[in-house]
C-alpha cells in the first residue's frame, strides 16, 4: 500500500495473506469457513493462509493449509480480465472477533465512493518495503469513462478502478488479490496498476466483484 | 519470438520533424516501458526518453524536452518518436528498446532484468 | 543526473586474454539497476548483464558482472574473436544514462 497508514486494529478481519512458505505472496478475502477470494493471478500450487492477526508472523494468528484454487475460467494472462479466484482450505477457518466472513456485494457502488484498500504489500516502488503490519489507504472508485482515458483499451468492462486525484496512494505489489471495500461490502479485488507504483492519476485496478457474485457462489457450491 | 521493428530509413530537411514508430511483437506492449535511445555516427548511446504504454506517461531527457514527443498505439502495439525542429547534429541511427515493467501486478517485487529488446534501428538523416 | 564514466576508452587485447572494463558512476547506484551491452558495428547493442551481475538469456559464462555503490566492472574472462566491440554500461533509476563506451580491439 502506497501513502497509506496501518489498519485500525481488528477493523479488517476478513482480510487474510497467502503465503509461499513464510513469504508473502497476495492478499485475500475470507468468504466464509472454508473459502478464500483472492486474484487468480495468484494462483500457486499450495498456500498458507494466515488469517485473524494484523500482524504477518504473529503467533496467534491462524494459519491454514490450502491445496485446492479455482480460478474464473475466462480469466486472461495478457489483459487481466476476469482476475480472480477461489482457494478451498484445506480446514475450517474458527470465526471470532478477529476473523469474520466478508460481505459479498449486492450491487455495484457509484463512482466517486469513497473505499478502503488494505495488504502487507510493499509501501515503497521500485525499490521494495514490506511492512509486517496491515496497511490502508483511502480511495475514491473512478468512472469506467474517466479511466479509459488513462488506460484507454487495457480497461475491460469487469474492471474497476480507484484513487484520489493527484495523489500516491494506492496499491502494490504484494496487495494482489486483498479487498476494496466500499460501505462495507466488498466491490474489488487488487489486480494491477502502473509501475512504479503510487504514480498520481494513474488508478489502481480492481476486479469488480458485484460482477461475479454469481460465479463465486455457483463455485463454491459445485466444489463442496 | 519478442521483437521490435520499426520504420525505415529517414531524409529530412533542418527545422522539419521526423515520426519514427516501433511495433512489438510476441510479449504484452503494456506490460513494458518503451525507451528510445539514439547514436550519432561514431558516438555513443545517448538516452532520449521513454513512455509508459498503460499510461501512456512520458519521462524525457532534459536535453530533448520540448522537441521530442512519444507517443503509444496499444490496439496495434506501436510506440512513436517524434522529434521536431531537426538540426544536422541530429542525424543517427535511432533505437527503441523495451525496458523495464510498466505495470505491477502479483506478488513479488520486480527485478530490472535489462533492456532484453532492440529495434532494429532507423537512420534517420538531417541535411538541406 | 547520475553521470557514468567507462575506462579505459579503448583496450587492446589478443583472443583468449581477459578483459576488464570499469564503471565509474558519480553517485551511488542501486546494483539492482546496472546493466552492460555490447554493440558491433551496423548492430542494435545487446543485453549482456543487467542487475550488475546477472546474465542474459544466451550469454555465456566468461562474461560476468560485480560491483556496487560507484563501481562496477565487466570481466571476460577469455576472449573469443567475436567479443571484439564497444561495451556500455547503463543505469537505470528510472531515468537512463549511458557511459561513454569501451572500445574492446585485436592487438
Known amino acids: 500500500i502506497i501513502d497509506g497508514a496501518p489498519c485500525a486494529r481488528g477493523s479488517h478481519p476478513w482480510q487474510v495473506a497467502l503465503l509461499s512458505g513464510n513469504q508473502l505472496h497476495c492478499g485475500g478475502v475470507l468468504v466464509n469457513e472454508r473459502w478464500v477470494l483472492t486474484a487468480a493471478h495468484c494462483k500457486m500450487n499450495e498456500y498458507t493462509v494466515h488469517l485473524g492477526s494484523d500482524t504477518l508472523g504473529d503467533r496467534r494468528a491462524q494459519r491454514i493449509k490450502a491445496s485446492k484454487s479455482f480460478r474464473h475460467p475466462g480469466y486472461s494472462t495478457q489483459t487481466h480480465v476476469n482476475d480472480l479466484m477461489l482457494v478451498k482450505l484445506n480446514s475450517q477457518a474458527r470465526l471470532s472477533s478477529m476473523v469474520k466472513k466478508v460481505r459479498l456485494p449486492s450491487r455495484c457502488e457509484p463512482p466517486g465512493t469513497t473505499c478502503t484498500v488494505s495488504g502487507w504489500g510493499t509501501t515503497t516502488s521500485p525499490d521494495v518495503t514490506f511492512p509486517s503490519d496491515l496497511m490502508c489507504v483511502d480511495v475514491k472508485l473512478i468512472s469506467p469513462q474517466d479511466c479509459t482515458k488513462v488506460y484507454k483499451d487495457l480497461l475491460e468492462n469487469s474492471m474497476l478502478c480507484a484513487g484520489i486525484p493527484d495523489s500516491k496512494k494506492n496499491a502494490c505489489n504484494g496487495d494482489s488479490g486483498g479487498p476494496l471495500v466500499c460501505r462495507g461490502t466488498l466491490q474489488g479485488l487488487v489486480s494491477w496498476g502502473t509501475f512504479p507504483c503510487g504514480q498520481p492519476n494513474d488508478p489502481g485496478v480492481y476486479t469488480q466483484v458485484c460482477k461475479f457474485t454469481k460465479w463465486i457462489n455457483d463455485t463454491m457450491k459445485k466444489h463442496r | 519470438q519478442v521483437q521490435l521493428v520499426q520504420s525505415g530509413a529517414e531524409v529530412k530537411k533542418p527545422g522539419a520533424s521526423v515520426k519514427v514508430s516501433c511495433k512489438a511483437s510476441?510479449?504484452?506492449?503494456?506490460?513494458?516501458?518503451m525507451h528510445w535511445v539514439r547514436q550519432a555516427p561514431g558516438q555513443g548511446l545517448e538516452w532520449m526518453g521513454s513512455?509508459?504504454?498503460?499510461?501512456?506517461?512520458?519521462n524525457y531527457a532534459q536535453k530533448f524536452q520540448g522537441r521530442v514527443t512519444m507517443t503509444r498505439d496499444t490496439s496495434i502495439s506501436t510506440a512513436y518518436m517524434e522529434l521536431s525542429r531537426l538540426r544536422s547534429d541530429d542525424t543517427a541511427v535511432y533505437y527503441c528498446?523495451?525496458?523495464?515493467?510498466?505495470?505491477?501486478?502479483?506478488?513479488?517485487?520486480?527485478?530490472?532484468?535489462?533492456?532484453?529488446?532492440w529495434g532494429q534501428g532507423t537512420t534517420v538523416t538531417v541535411s538541406s | 543526473e547520475i553521470v557514468l564514466t567507462q575506462s579505459p576508452g579503448t583496450l587492446s587485447l589478443s583472443p583468449g586474454e581477459r578483459a576488464t572494463l570499469s564503471c565509474r558512476a558519480s553517485?551511488?547506484?542501486?546494483?539492482?539497476?546496472l546493466a552492460w551491452y555490447q554493440q558491433k558495428p551496423g548492430q542494435a547493442p545487446r543485453l549482456l548483464i543487467y542487475?550488475?551481475?546477472s546474465r542474459a538469456t544466451g550469454i555465456p559464462d566468461r562474461f560476468s558482472g560485480s560491483g556496487s555503490g560507484t563501481d562496477f566492472t565487466l570481466t571476460i574472462s577469455r576472449l573469443e574473436p567475436e567479443d571484439f566491440a564497444v561495451y556500455y554500461c547503463?543505469?537505470?533509476?528510472?531515468?537512463?544514462?549511458f557511459g561513454g563506451g569501451t572500445k574492446v580491439e585485436i592487438k
Open positions: 528498446a523495451r525496458g523495464g515493467p510498466s505495470t505491477w501486478y502479483g506478488g513479488s517485487a520486480y527485478t530490472y532484468y535489462g533492456a532484453d529488446v
Open positions: 510476441g510479449y504484452t506492449f503494456a506490460g513494458y516501458d
Open positions: 513512455i509508459n504504454p498503460t499510461s501512456g506517461r512520458t
Open positions: 553517485q551511488s547506484v542501486s546494483s539492482d539497476y
Open positions: 542487475g550488475a551481475s
Open positions: 547503463q543505469q537505470y533509476a528510472p531515468l537512463w544514462t
